[in-house]
Interface confidence: low
């Protein structure tokens, strides 16, 4: 079964996923998607990296760690009950069928009831967007997948590969850490 992680409504959720680059800066594309890892790619992609940078993300999803050192753990900001479910971290090692797939189950619990503060802090002021501080502006044009033929600012999401639905729940038991090279 999937490894399970928990968070409370309103908190940030953390889903760990790591790999060891073969050499410094020798990055491997990674995608994070909602739903169990299918045979190929990720399903509904929420974040993607390529050999150089984070090239696609959606609001509330970011990498807090140093992805250039292989820490591709996903942070989901200000979670709600709807964020519960399985997430796929796919480390897209070059070569056919070499990908490493990790399914992580996120369980969201209702927030503990506490007395309301006299004045609520603005959430976005308390938690500024990591992606902005890293210099990743919003994608100007949304197109598909980890595609080699378009600018990084244009890249968006979608599984580049067709999958046989019978194999879509190809789940792993191992922890989400691998070594490459």
């Amino acid at each position: 079964s999937e490894v399970e992680y928990r968070a409370e409504v309103g908190q940030n959720a953390y889903l760990p996923c790591f790999y060891t680059p073969a050499a410094p800066g020798n990055l491997v594309p990674v995608c994070w998607g909602k739903g169990a890892c299918p045979v190929f790619e990720c399903g509904n992609v929420v974040l993607r990296t390529d050999e150089r940078d984070v090239n696609y993300w959606t609001s509330r999803y970011w990498l807090n760690g140093d992805f250039r050192k292989g820490d591709v753990s996903l942070t989901i900001e200000n979670v709600t009950l709807a964020d519960s479910g399985i997430y796929c971290c796919r480390i897209q090692i070059p070569g056919i069928m070499n990908d490493e797939k990790f399914n992580l189950k996120l369980v969201i619990k209702p927030a503990k009831v506490t007395p309301a503060p006299t004045r609520q802090r603005d959430f976005t002021a308390a938690f500024p967007r990591m992606l902005t501080t890293r210099g990743h502006g919003p994608a100007e044009t949304q197109t598909l997948g980890s595609l080699p033929d378009i600018n990084l600012t244009q890249i968006s999401t979608l599984a580049n590969e067709l999958r046989d639905s019978r194999l879509a729940n190809d789940l792993r038991d191992s922890g989400a850490t691998i070594r490459i090279g």
Epitope: G35, V45, D149
Partner: antibody
């Protein structure tokens, strides 16, 4: 089993609006994106774009920017294609197709005629 | 846009014969990860397309083994050994590496 069931045929006049539905069953709707594909009478297939069913973010091919809108009703596992200001050249069969087009709806025939 | 050119436009065959359809792309369909994003569909009259082969040579679930795909780079072939009546229809190739996704013009497989 996995099924995509589309709404029935439509007859519209130029300038009107149409909204075509695609109801999914047999899988978790929000785990797979939804594509839309156009097939004009006697012609080939043209990819219109897709919508991420988890984030709701649509992507449109260049030829389908402006009058075309993809949307979702997640609670009903349904994707929608809306075409505004209909033109005669919108006459076609429109297909929804899951993710990378592994499963398709049966198609919705739209006829635009004055 | 990537242009997908299919030949022939029409392919008359006798039942039991072998059929071969060619698809050529205007750009390479090979991704840096080593995969090639070329797929084949069959559309029967009045029906939606059905996926037959994905990634050049992988048969989709439920597709008979008389269907096979081959090729690399920009040149691809779909072969049907022992054509059956249920195989008749229009075959499309498509690519899903370059945006927008594009389809070939179709090859109509019909009885000779």
């Amino acid at each position: 089993q996995i099924q995509l069931v589309q709404s029935g045929p439509e007859l519209k006049k130029p300038g009107e609006t149409v909204k075509i539905s695609c109801k999914a069953s047999g899988y978790t709707f929000t785990n797979y994106g939804m594509n839309w594909v156009k097939q004009a009478p006697g012609k080939g297939l043209k990819w219109m774009g897709w919508i991420n069913t988890y984030t709701g973010e649509p992507t449109y091919a260049d030829d389908f920017k402006g009058r075309f809108a993809f949307s979702l009703e997640t609670s009903a596992s349904t994707a929608y294609l809306q075409i505004n200001n209909l033109k005669n050249e919108d006459t076609a069969t429109y297909f929804c197709a899951r993710d990378l087009m592994d499963y398709w709806g049966q198609g919705t025939t739209l006829t635009v005629s004055s | 846009d990537v242009v997908m050119t299919q030949t022939p436009l029409s392919l008359p065959v006798s039942l039991g014969d072998q059929a071969s359809i060619s698809c050529r792309s205007s750009q390479s369909l090979v991704h840096s990860n080593g995969n090639t994003y070329l797929h084949w569909y069959l559309q029967k009259p009045g029906q939606s397309p059905k996926l037959l082969i994905y990634k050049v040579s992988n048969r989709f679930s439920g597709v008979p083994d008389r269907f096979s795909g081959s090729g690399s780079g920009t040149d691809f072939t779909l072969k049907i050994t022992r054509v059956e009546a249920e195989d008749l229809g229009v075959y499309f190739c498509s690519q899903s590496i370059h945006v927008p996704y594009t389809f070939g013009g179709g090859t109509k497989l019909e009885i000779k």
